[in-house]
């Protein structure tokens, strides 16, 4: 039985198909030029060395050419996401050539066998591109390979094998099993195109990570940390089908990468922005909302070409459905404590009031713990554009009914039994918008009353554009 193929070795004998099903007539890899948005319309099949179909089907040699490469399939048929992507590409780039790479006979295998077919499919695409390059006006620079799951690594092989350099490869949640940690020639990598951008939506540190966790492109974007996608929880999928199962969750999260890309094509007026960060936890803390030195980028089709010397990991939050865009805010809150309060874990909520709209009540996620007499940084995000922020309501949630919060209350009391009044002082909140990069300072509405305790709230009004106050030295602890 075949084993995974390295960059060397014969290609023609590599098709890994169990003997019992090797009775195929049509070629294993077909190139379907989609001439219409209608999924029922068959389009044209391109054939290596045959120029007539190119002319008959109106292949535009000077236009952009997209190759959509599907992944492993259990069903053996094209899934709905593919038709949506074809339609979105036609909508956005009216003159472009949209080619669907149909390798269903080789993908409709055991996953591991399909993996072992990726190299030969990549080689077929490279040969097609080499042949197209022989035509006048066709340029590899205009070629954009879009691969989903296993298809992302097929795109990598194609980019590796082609004579010259493909303009762009987009990897939509590249497959993880058998590729995680693999040599760069055996998976998608930055060397495979002039620009390789990747969306990771199903990465897991437990169980089996269906999407690859490691960065494999010039930019690697991890929406919602690259793991739990909003709207894909068991509860969400349970609501939409007779039986919500882990497989539905997997499909929802893995496929989310495609829908984020489609969103970037059809909702270009609502682009989602991602921010460079070393890891998901730092991003959750709100530390990484900078656009300086190419530290932020649009995601999906609108991503600006960045060819860093090393991989750039980027993060963002999204909504549960299209349009996926949210508005990110970094909030810096300097917390003073006049009493030694021991370890304290307040549950803070904020409501943002803007010129266009007011936000819902948003939790301040405490990634580690609240530092007293220090600046604490938080990430909050809203689904609607609030416009210019005017004021902020900060609430410290009172004793909750949850056992966890009751335990927190009890533990806090046990550590400080003679401290009945838990109280923190917050004079101002600094806010930075990720999308506009605008910095604002909000001061306590009543400068004489800056204390907050469980069940209480504080109001802050915008008191300055920018962060530095008059006569102010830097705060004790300033996070980057």
């Amino acid at each position: 039985s075949p084993t995974p193929f390295g960059p060397e070795g014969q290609l023609e004998d590599e098709l890994h198909k169990p003997k019992a099903i090797q009775t195929e007539v049509k070629p294993s890899v077909r190139f379907n030029l989609r001439t219409s948005k209608d999924p029922e319309h068959e389009g044209c099949y391109l054939s290596l060395g045959h120029s007539q179909p190119l002319e008959d089907c109106g292949f535009n040699m000077t236009a952009k050419t997209f190759f959509i490469i599907h992944g492993w399939t259990m069903s053996g048929i094209f899934e709905n996401w593919l038709h949506k992507l074809v339609s979105a590409l036609h909508t956005r780039e009216k003159d472009a050539n949209v080619v669907v790479v149909d390798w269903l006979p080789l993908a409709h295998q055991l996953y591991t066998d399909a993996v072992n077919n990726t190299r030969v499919v990549g080689h077929s695409i490279a040969r097609m591109l080499d042949w197209l390059q022989e035509k006048d006006d066709f340029s590899l620079e205009n070629v954009h390979l879009i691969g989903y799951s296993l298809g992302a690594h097929v795109a990598g092989y194609a980019g590796n094998f082609v004579k010259g350099t493909v303009g762009r490869i987009t990897g939509l949640d590249p497959a993880g099993p058998m590729f995680e940690g693999a040599d760069i020639h055996k998976r998608l990598s930055p060397d495979d195109a002039d620009f390789v951008d990747v969306l990771h939506t199903y990465t897991r540190s437990f169980g089996l990570s269906i999407g690859i966790q490691m960065p494999v492109g010039h930019i690697d974007i991890y929406p919602n940390g690259g793991d739990f996608q909003p709207g894909c929880g068991l509860n969400d999928v349970l609501g939409s089908m007779a039986y919500g199962t882990i497989t539905e969750v997997v499909k929802c999260e893995h496929e989310r990468a495609v829908h984020l890309f489609v969103d970037s094509l059809v909702n270009q007026d609502k682009p989602s922005f991602a921010f460079q960060c070393t890891d998901s936890n730092r991003f959750k803390k709100g530390i990484c909302l900078s656009c300086r030195k190419n530290r932020c980028n649009s995601i999906g089709y609108n991503a600006k070409k960045m060819r860093n010397k090393r991989n750039s990991k980027m993060y963002l939050k999204t909504r549960a459905g299209m349009p996926f865009r949210v508005y990110h805010y970094q909030m810096k809150i300097h917390v003073f404590s006049y009493k030694n309060m021991g370890e304290i874990e307040p549950t803070f909520y904020v409501t943002l009031y803007g010129t266009n709209a007011d936000s819902q009540t948003l939790p301040l996620e405490i990634v580690e713990r609240i530092e007293q007499n220090a600046t604490n940084t938080f990430l909050v995000y809203t689904e609607e554009d609030l416009g210019d922020l005017l004021k902020i309501q900060l609430t410290w949630e009172g004793a909750s009914q949850s056992w966890y919060n009751l335990w927190k209350e009890l533990r806090s009391y046990l550590s400080q039994p003679h401290n009945p009044g838990r109280e923190l002082n917050i004079r101002r909140i600094r806010v930075k918008s990720g999308e506009t990069q605008r910095k604002l300072t909000f001061c306590a509405e009543d400068p004489e009353n800056t204390s907050i305790s469980p069940g209480r709230e504080l109001w802050f009004r915008k008191c300055r554009d920018g962060w530095r106050m008059k006569n102010e030295t830097s705060p004790t602890v300033e996070l980057p």
């Epitope: 995974p4 169990p18 259990m74 069903s75 066998d113 099993p177």
Partner: antibody, heavy 119, light 107 residues
Amino acid sequence: QVQLQQSGAELVKPGASVRLSCKASGYTFTKYTIHWVKQRSGQGLEWIGWFYPGSDSIKYNEKFKDKATLTADKSSRTVYMELSRLTSEDSAVYFCARHEEYTNSLAYWGQGTLVTVSA
Amino acid sequence: DIQMTQTTSSLSASLGDRVTISCRASQDISNYLNWYQQQPDGTVKLLIYYTSRLHSGVPSRFSGSGSGTDYSLTISNLEQEDIATYFCQQGYTLPWTFGGGTNLEIK
């Protein structure tokens, strides 16, 4: 919860055929592959083949392709395996099990059906 | 076909013992190795998938390790209910193949 309920024990004559059933419940039937596995008395397990109800896709172990025929009835959420031209070598317990995608494991098993081939 | 070999067909151990069962593949199976438990009544359960991932509901005393061609299943603290036959299976390529099984008994 996921359950695979198999049909009862069968006593059949050499040369005859038998049809075993595996009724699935607790999940979306068309989204998972059902595998069949053979276990002869006191011996190991042998993979026979799979049936994927989503597209009626079937794969067989070469060794069983002239012995087993897999079919399904979506309306009753049941996968069938017909064993033909039975000999004493076919006397065994036959299990159906559900495939977990990507991991290539069998996460849920039926209770097994004992087939005895005897004159 | 890939051959799966469990060299120990029978193993005796005492309750509370740490038990290791090994399995060897005739070629590299890229971690596509699963472990199953068959109880005395014939019931089969998945314990470990993809070499080391614990299937839901399986006690944490079970663990798996290995790579390439050599894999093992460890039970850290043997309990009465663990008395069963254990099979390894490769899911790397068709046809899927199983080891001959290791029957675990109480000393």
